[in-house]
């Protein structure tokens, strides 16, 4: 069987939701010593990067300027060490936002609720779209989809304090082209405790998986890498 290197990790720097005309940055994290990285878009070669020096860096960044609907879609990457190619990375969905109009987001029965109450978000957009998306800040990968003409409902069921936070919605013209984001709606949920003071919303840390973690190799890392390579050979 043809030997391949482990698949790289593909990430979007800061976010996979990129406003139109802005620059998107994708990171492909492979291996120290990789001489070439290829970015593929919808299955075809899109860009090539060659790290300098290859033995000192474990990945590259691909800059995609002037984001638009033609550049939105599924990306993957591969890398090469010598003549040996890696497996393909997982697919990354890159979305263009700020297309057309801005939806309005509202919440029923209101933005302040008690744990156990049934909550529904409503996203409304008057321009022609049938798919709507609801995202919680700091959880942008957990996209909820709903369908409807002009307006969609997002029933959350009986909420818990884990639902606390800030929400936005988008109208979607296709899977990869979204509207401007709505104004955020902050949902405050108090628990069943007798203390009725409002607990603060969850901190909205940036999504940990939307960060590029490319590192330059130090002497220690090189020793560890050499030890790991030797160990792998011994195991073989």
């Amino acid at each position: 069987p043809k030997q391949t290197l482990p698949k790289p990790i593909i990430r979007a720097e800061s976010t996979y939701m990129v406003p139109k005309e802005k620059q998107a940055t994708l990171c492909c994290q492979g291996s120290y010593g990789a001489v070439e990285y290829q970015l593929h878009f919808e299955g075809s070669l899109f860009a090539v990067e060659r790290p300098k020096p290859p033995e000192r860096i474990n990945g590259v960044k691909f800059h995609i300027p002037d984001m638009n609907s033609r550049k939105a879609g599924r990306y993957s990457c591969i890398y090469r060490v010598g003549e040996l190619w890696s497996e393909r990375s997982d697919l990354l969905d890159l979305v263009v936002t700020e297309m057309y109009d801005t939806p309005t987001l509202s919440v029923h029965p209101g933005p302040e609720v008690t744990s156990g109450e049934k909550v529904t978000f409503y996203c409304r957009l008057d321009t022609a779209t049938s798919m709507f998306l609801l995202l919680k800040e700091g959880r942008s990968r957990d996209v909820q989809r709903s369908y409807g003409k002009v307006q969609a409902e997002f029933p959350m069921g009986p909420v818990t304090t884990a639902h606390r936070g800030s929400y936005r919605c988008f109208g979607s013209y296709n899977n990869y082209a979204w509207s401007f984001p709505s104004e955020p709606v902050k949902l405050l949920v108090t628990g069943d405790i007798e203390n009725t003071s409002l607990a603060p919303t969850d901190p909205t840390f940036p999504d940990s998986w939307d960060t590029c973690l490319l590192t330059r190799e130090t002497g220690l890392q090189k020793d560890l890498a050499l030890w790991d390579h030797t160990a792998q050979n011994l195991l073989r």
Epitope: S106, G110, E112, G116, R124
Partner: antibody, heavy 117, light 107 residues
Framework: QVQLQQPGAELVRPGASVRLSCKAS?????TYWMHWVKLRPGQGFEW???????????NYNEKFKRKATLTVDKSSSTAYMQLSSLTSEDSAVYYC??????????WGQGTSVTVSS | DIQMTQTTSSLSASLGDRVTISCRAS??????LNWFQQKPDGTVKLLIY???RLHSGVPSRFSGSGSGTDYSLTISNLEQEDIATYFC?????????FGGGTKLEIK
């Protein structure tokens, strides 16, 4: 502070329609659903329905679906309820109310509607 | 729709008394039970939400309790300004429904 201003009284003929108003101030009008509640003497409150001033979405009590129509005017922060085909059964005090926190915590003074020929 | 029943339509008590008003739901309302006060001039105020939580500005002599289908409002030390009609309301399911009210009078 939060205020919901309603006119004191309306006298209307049987079979006619009436539009009741509720002018809101002291909070973000488009964020909170506006509720309408009916009170007939000795009969307790009945919830008519609610409207989302942000997008015009409504929920009605099935009993009032053909009787009441809820609308808003965002520019003046005013909610309206139109009552049609009035009969003596519609003589009551009608309240607007909002839920800022965990229940209907702010109420208007109520408008007394008398249906009489 | 959930039916809310306040069996006592009127109640007489003396100033300083401890008064309890009860309310029963036709099915479990999961503690989403609120109490309102309507003064003789028609003014309506929220007193208690979620069975036992005191709304801001409401005197601590008011308290609420209950679970499932049975709930009660207690006024621990009746004052003249408490003369009003009291309504329970369930917020568990749409449409919200109210009890018929209990009118509190002074002996």
């Amino acid at each position: 502070q939060v205020q919901l201003q309603q006119p004191g009284a309306e006298l209307v003929r049987p079979g006619a329609s009436v539009r009741l108003s509720c002018k809101a101030s002291g909070y973000t009008f488009t964020t909170y659903w506006m509720h309408w509640v009916k009170l007939r003497p000795g009969q307790g409150f009945e919830w008519i329905g609610e409207i989302n001033p942000g997008n015009g979405g409504t929920n009605y009590n099935e009993k009032f679906k053909r009787k009441a129509t809820l609308t808003v005017d965002k520019s003046s922060s005013t909610a309206y309820m139109q009552l049609s085909s009035l009969t003596s059964e519609d003589s009551a005090v009608y309240y607007c109310a909002i839920r800022l926190r965990f229940a209907l915590d702010y109420w208007g003074q109520g408008t007394s509607v008398t249906v009489s020929s | 729709d959930i039916q809310m029943t306040q069996t006592t339509s009127s109640l007489s008590a003396s100033l300083g008394d401890r008064v309890t008003i009860s309310c029963r739901a036709s099915q479990d309302v999961r503690n989403f039970l609120n109490w309102f006060q309507q003064k003789p001039d028609g003014t309506v105020k929220l007193l208690i939400y979620f069975t036992s939580r005191l709304h801001s500005g409401v005197p601590s002599r008011f308290s609420g309790s209950g679970s499932g289908t049975d709930y009660s409002l207690t006024i621990s030390n009746l004052e003249q300004e408490d003369i009003a009609t009291y309504f329970c309301q369930q917020g568990n399911t749409l449409p919200p429904t109210f009890g018929g009210g209990t009118k509190l009078e002074i002996k």
